[in-house]
Interface confidence: low
C-alpha cells in the first residue's frame, strides 16, 4: 500500500539503485516515486553532514522485502516512494529554495525582477529544468537579478551549494503550466534525427510518448514498430533531444512513428502510467513472482498491488492454466520497460498501474459565511482541492468554498446549506482559478447527497461540517485533486505553515473576488482564542487562526473552504472555514471546524454511503 511517513534522523542502509542531488527530502521522494526500481529513499540535508560532496545527497534504494535496515544519522530524512499513492503522485514541484544555488549547465542568462519571473521563464523554455536567481542583495553587483536557466543530464542539479541571496527552483512544466504548448500529433512513417538520450522497448508509440514525457531530457521520440525491417530494432523507442529543442531533420521511413514529449502541454499532462492491455503479446523481464489468477485484469491488479512489479504477462497456454485460472507472470527490469516484446503469443501483457494518479475511489488520509482579507492571487494548480459551491436560482452565484477529499466527495461547512438544503440548486466547480472563466459551457458537478452533521444547529457554531457526495466521480488532474485529511484526533502535530484560500470578500463590506485568493495565517491556541471570544464557547473541535494585529483573515464567501497546513512536505486539511467576528479584525481570529476531530464521522459517512470502504490511509 501507500506509505507516506518520513523518518527523521534515519538513513536506510544498502539497496542503492541511484543517487543524485536534490534540494529537499520531498523532491528526493518524488524522484524515488518516478524511478522504476526505487522503493525507499534517504536524504542528507546540508546541516546533517560535513562532507560537502554528500550534502543534499538523495539516495534511491530498492529492496526485495520492501524495507531496509535504518541506521541513526542526525538530520537525515528517509521515507518511501509514493508509488501506489494515487493522487499524491506528481512530478510537479513548486517550491523555491532560498540561500541555495542549484548547479547545472547554464544555457541562458537574463535580468529579471523576481524569482517568480525567473521560474516562469524556466517553465516557458523548452530545455530548462531548473534555475537560480541572484537577488538584489547578492554580494556581486553585476550578478544581481540574474536569472540562470539550467539543465543537466539527469534533470537534477549536478551539485547544490549553500549561497546567500540566491534562490533556486524547478521548472513548472510538470505542473502543466508551460506557455509553450505541445504537439499532440503522432507522425506515421517518419523518423527523427538527433541525439538518443535513452532507448527502451515499448509495445506502441503511445507508451513511448508517455515515457518521453516523463524522461528529464526527452524532447521528441522515434518508435520502430513490430514490423520494422531490422528485427533487433523492433519495438525500440528512441528518446531524443537536440540543442535547438526540435528535431534538426526527419526522414520518411516506413514502420516508424515519431512524436513529441507532452511535458509542455498546458493544463493537462498524460498520466505517468500505461493502462492498456496488449493481447497476443509477451513482455520479457526479470521474474518477480508467478501466481494463478482468473483473467488478465486480475493479473494487472496483482501486479499493481505488488509494488516492485513493473509489468506482467498473463499466459493462456493450456499448460499454464488450471480450471479458470492461468499463470500471471509478474516482472521487472532495470528501466521499467520489458527487456523483450514478443508478438503472436497466447499471452496478454501490460503494465502496473502503481503510478496512475487516479488510484482507487478513496478519500485520502494521512497520519494532514466567511473571503480572504489581506491575501494575494493564487496560481493555477496551487490549491487543486479548492472547489466553488454555487447556487443557481434565477441567477447563479458563488456562496461557499469546499475541499475535494475523494473522487466523489467534497467537505464543506454545514452553514453553507442554511436555508438551501435542496441539492438540485447547487453547482460545484472544480479545477478553476478565476470565477469569471465560468460560462454556461463550463462543466460542473451536481450533488447526489448532502450529509450535514447530525449535531449541527442553524446559527450555532458547533459541528459546522458537511459532506457532499457528487453524482459522478471526478478524474484527478494537476488542477483537480484531493487534499489529504489528518489522522483522527491529530493533536501532537505542530503546524507552522498554514494557508486559507477562497473567493470570498476582501474586506468586511466587500464583494466576491474573481481570482482565488490565498493567505498565510498562523494557528492560535484554543486558550488564546477563547480569550478573544468570551461570549462563545471555543471547543476542542474547533481550531483558530489569525494575526494578533488582524489584517489577514477569511471572510464572507470563504466559508466551507480549506485551512490547509504543510507538514513534512504534505498538505493536510486541518480546518474548514466556519465563523469569526467580522473579518481580519484585531485580536479576533478566524474560527475553523477542526477536521481531525471529525475523522470518525467522515469515515462512517463516506463508507456507509457506498457500502464499501471509501477511505485509505497511506500510512
Amino acid at each position: 500500500g501507500c506509505l507516506t511517513q518520513l523518518y527523521e534522523n534515519a538513513f536506510f542502509r544498502g539497496g542503492d539503485v541511484a543517487s543524485m542531488y536534490t534540494p529537499n527530502a520531498q523532491y528526493c521522494q518524488m524522484r524515488c516515486t518516478f524511478h522504476p526500481r526505487c522503493l525507499l529513499f534517504s536524504f542528507l540535508p546540508a546541516s546533517s553532514i560535513n562532507d560537502m560532496e554528500k550534502r543534499f545527497g538523495c539516495f534511491l534504494k530498492d529492496s526485495v522485502t520492501g524495507t531496509l535496515p535504518k541506521v541513526h544519522r542526525t538530520g537525515a530524512v528517509s521515507g518511501h516512494s509514493l508509488k501506489q499513492c494515487g493522487h499524491q503522485i506528481s512530478a510537479c514541484h513548486r517550491d523555491i529554495y532560498k540561500g541555495v544555488d542549484m548547479r547545472g549547465v547554464n544555457f541562458n542568462v537574463s535580468k529579471v525582477s523576481s524569482v517568480e519571473e525567473c521560474q516562469k521563464r524556466c517553465t516557458s523554455n523548452i530545455r530548462c529544468q531548473f534555475f537560480s536567481y541572484a537577488t538584489q542583495t547578492f554580494h556581486k553587483a553585476e550578478y544581481r537579478n540574474n536569472c540562470l536557466l539550467k539543465y543537466s543530464p539527469g534533470g537534477t542539479p549536478t551539485a547544490i551549494k549553500v549561497l546567500s541571496n540566491v534562490e533556486s527552483g524547478f521548472s513548472l512544466k510538470p505542473c502543466a503550466l508551460s506557455e509553450i504548448g505541445c504537439h499532440m500529433n503522432i507522425f506515421q512513417h517518419l523518423a527523427f534525427s538527433d541525439v538518443d538520450v535513452a532507448r527502451v522497448l515499448t509495445p506502441d508509440a503511445f507508451v513511448c510518448r508517455t515515457i518521453c514525457t516523463y524522461h528529464p531530457n526527452c524532447l521528441f521520440f522515434t518508435f520502430y514498430t513490430n514490423v520494422w525491417k531490422i528485427e533487433s530494432q523492433r519495438n525500440v523507442c528512441l528518446l531524443k533531444t537536440s540543442e535547438s529543442g526540435t528535431p534538426s531533420s526527419s526522414t520518411p521511413q516506413e514502420n516508424t512513428i515519431s512524436g513529441y514529449s507532452l511535458l509542455t502541454c498546458k493544463r493537462t499532462l498524460p498520466e505517468p502510467c500505461h493502462s492498456k492491455i496488449y493481447p497476443g503479446v509477451d513482455f520479457g523481464g526479470e521474474e518477480l513472482n508467478v501466481t494463478f489468477v482468473k483473467g488478465v485484469n486480475v493479473c494487472q491488479e496483482t501486479c499493481t498491488k505488488m509494488i516492485r512489479c513493473q509489468f506482467f504477462t498473463y499466459s493462456l497456454l493450456p499448460e499454464d492454466c488450471k480450471e479458470e485460472k492461468c499463470k500471471c507472470f509478474l516482472r521487472l527490469s532495470m528501466d521499467g520497460s520489458p527487456t523483450r516484446i514478443a508478438y503472436g503469443t497466447q499471452g496478454s501483457s501490460g503494465y502496473s498501474l502503481r503510478l496512475c494518479n487516479t488510484g482507487d475511489n478513496s478519500v485520502c488520509t494521512t497520519k494532514t459565511s466567511t473571503r480572504i482579507v489581506g491575501g494575494t492571487n493564487s496560481s493555477w494548480g496551487e490549491w487543486p482541492w479548492q472547489v466553488s459551491l454555487q447556487v443557481k436560482l434565477t441567477a447563479q452565484r458563488h456562496l461557499c468554498g469546499g475541499s475535494l477529499i475523494g473522487h466523489q466527495w467534497v467537505l464543506t461547512a454545514a452553514h453553507c446549506f442554511d436555508g438551501l438544503p435542496l441539492q438540485d440548486v447547487w453547482r460545484i466547480y472544480s479545477g478553476i482559478l478565476n470565477l469569471s472563466d465560468i460560462t454556461k459551457d463550463t462543466p460542473f458537478s451536481q450533488i447526489k447527497e448532502i450529509i450535514i452533521h447530525q449535531n449541527y444547529k442553524v446559527s450555532e457554531g458547533n459541528h459546522d461540517i458537511a459532506l457532499i457526495k457528487l453524482q459522478a466521480p471526478l478524474n484527478y488532474t494537476e488542477f483537480q485533486k484531493p487534499i489529504c485529511l489528518p489522522s483522527k484526533g491529530d493533536t501532537s502535530t505542530i503546524y507552522t505553515n498554514c494557508w486559507v484560500t477562497g473567493w470570498g470578500f476582501s474586506k468586511e463590506k466587500g464583494e466576491i473576488q474573481n481570482i482565488l485568493q490565498k493567505v498565510n495565517i498562523p494557528l492560535v491556541t484554543n486558550e488564546e482564542c477563547q480569550k478573544r471570544y468570551q461570549d462563545y464557547k471555543i471547543t476542542q473541535r474547533m481550531v483558530c487562526a489569525g494575526y494578533k494585529e488582524g489584517g489577514k483573515d477569511a471572510c464572507k464567501g470563504d466559508s466551507g473552504g480549506p485551512l490547509v497546513c504543510k507538514h513534512n512536505g504534505m498538505w493536510r486539511l486541518v480546518g474548514i472555514t466556519s465563523w469569526g467576528e467580522g473579518c481580519a479584525r484585531r485580536e479576533q481570529p478566524g474560527v475553523y471546524t477542526k477536521v481531525a476531530e471529525y475523522m470518525d464521522w467522515i469515515l462512517e459517512k463516506t463508507q456507509s454511503s457506498d457500502g464499501k470502504a471509501q477511505m485509505q490511509s497511506p500510512a
Partner: antibody, heavy 120, light 107 residues
Framework: EVQLLESGGGLVQPGGSLRLSCAAS????????MDWVRQAPGKGLEWVSS????????SYADSVKGRFTISRDNSKNTLYLQMNSLRAEDTAVYYC?????????????WGQGTMVTVSS | DIQMTQSPSSLSASVGDRVTITCRAS??????LNWYQQKPGKAPQLLMY???SLQSGVPSRFSGSGSGTDFTLTISSLQPEDFATYFC?????????FGGGTKVEIK
C-alpha cells in the same frame, strides 16, 4: 572530431592504486552513458564498468566490484576510474568507450587505451 | 552472465575470399548482437549493431545475420584492410559480454 583520450596508466605493485582519466571532446559528453572496457595482453575484451549521464547510476563487473569506482565530471567532459587493491589479473589495456543504445548496449566510440601493469 | 562463444578463433584467407565468422550465445539474446573490428595496437571499432545494421562508414561487404543464440558475420569479398580480429558482443543484458575473438590472417 569525436574523440576519447585516456591517461593515468602505468606500473603499480599489487595492492596499489591508480586513477585513470578519459577526456572527451567533439560531442555532448553529458548526454551519454560512458564505460570502461579492458583487454588483457593477447586476450579478449572485458567490460569493466558503466556510468549513466547524471553520474547517479553506476554498474560494475563482479571481478572489480568493491575495488574500482567509476565517476565523471560533466563540467570537465571527463570520465574517471579509481582502481584500488590492484591485482596481477587487472593487468590490461583500459579503454574508455561511449555507450550507445539502438542495438542493445554497444560502444560506438573508443579511446586509444592506456596500459595498466600490476607487478611486483 | 551470458557466455559468448566465437568460432573459429583464427582463420587464414586471401583477398577476395568470402569469410564467415560465427558467434553463439549461451542463452537467447534476441537480436542484441554487435560486432567490432580491432587492428593490432588499436582500439576496437563498432562495425555492426543489432545483428545486421552497419555502423556509418562501414562498407557494405560486411553483413550480419541470425537471432536468438546463433549469429554470423560475413565479409563477402575480403579486402587487405579487413585483416584484423573480430569480436562479437551481446547488448541484451548487463553485464555485456564479448566473444573471445576471431583473428583473420592473410593466407
Amino acid at each position: 572530431e569525436v574523440q576519447l583520450l585516456e591517461s593515468g596508466g602505468g606500473l603499480v605493485q599489487p595492492g596499489g592504486s591508480l586513477r585513470l582519466s578519459c577526456a572527451a571532446s567533439g560531442f555532448t559528453f553529458s548526454w551519454y552513458r560512458m564505460d570502461w572496457v579492458r583487454q588483457a595482453p593477447g586476450k579478449g575484451l572485458e567490460w569493466v564498468s558503466s556510468i549513466w549521464p547524471s553520474g547517479g547510476l553506476t554498474s560494475y563487473a563482479d571481478s572489480v566490484k568493491g575495488r574500482f569506482t567509476i565517476s565523471r565530471d560533466n563540467s570537465k567532459n571527463t570520465l574517471y576510474l579509481q582502481m584500488n587493491s590492484l591485482r596481477a589479473e587487472d593487468t590490461a589495456v583500459y579503454y574508455c568507450a561511449r555507450g550507445w543504445a539502438p542495438g542493445g548496449d554497444a560502444f560506438d566510440i573508443w579511446g586509444q587505451g592506456t596500459m595498466v601493469t600490476v607487478s611486483s | 552472465d551470458i557466455q559468448m562463444t566465437q568460432s573459429p578463433s583464427s582463420l587464414s584467407a586471401s583477398v577476395g575470399d568470402r569469410v564467415t565468422i560465427t558467434c553463439r550465445a549461451s542463452q537467447s539474446i534476441s537480436a542484441y548482437l554487435n560486432w567490432y573490428q580491432q587492428k593490432p595496437g588499436k582500439a576496437p571499432q563498432l562495425l555492426m549493431y543489432g545483428v545486421g545494421s552497419l555502423q556509418s562508414g562501414v562498407p557494405s561487404r560486411f553483413s550480419g545475420s541470425g537471432s536468438g543464440t546463433d549469429f554470423t558475420l560475413t565479409i563477402s569479398s575480403l579486402q587487405p584492410e579487413d585483416f584484423a580480429t573480430y569480436f562479437c558482443q551481446q547488448g541484451y543484458t548487463t553485464p555485456v559480454t564479448f566473444g573471445g575473438g576471431t583473428k583473420v590472417e592473410i593466407k
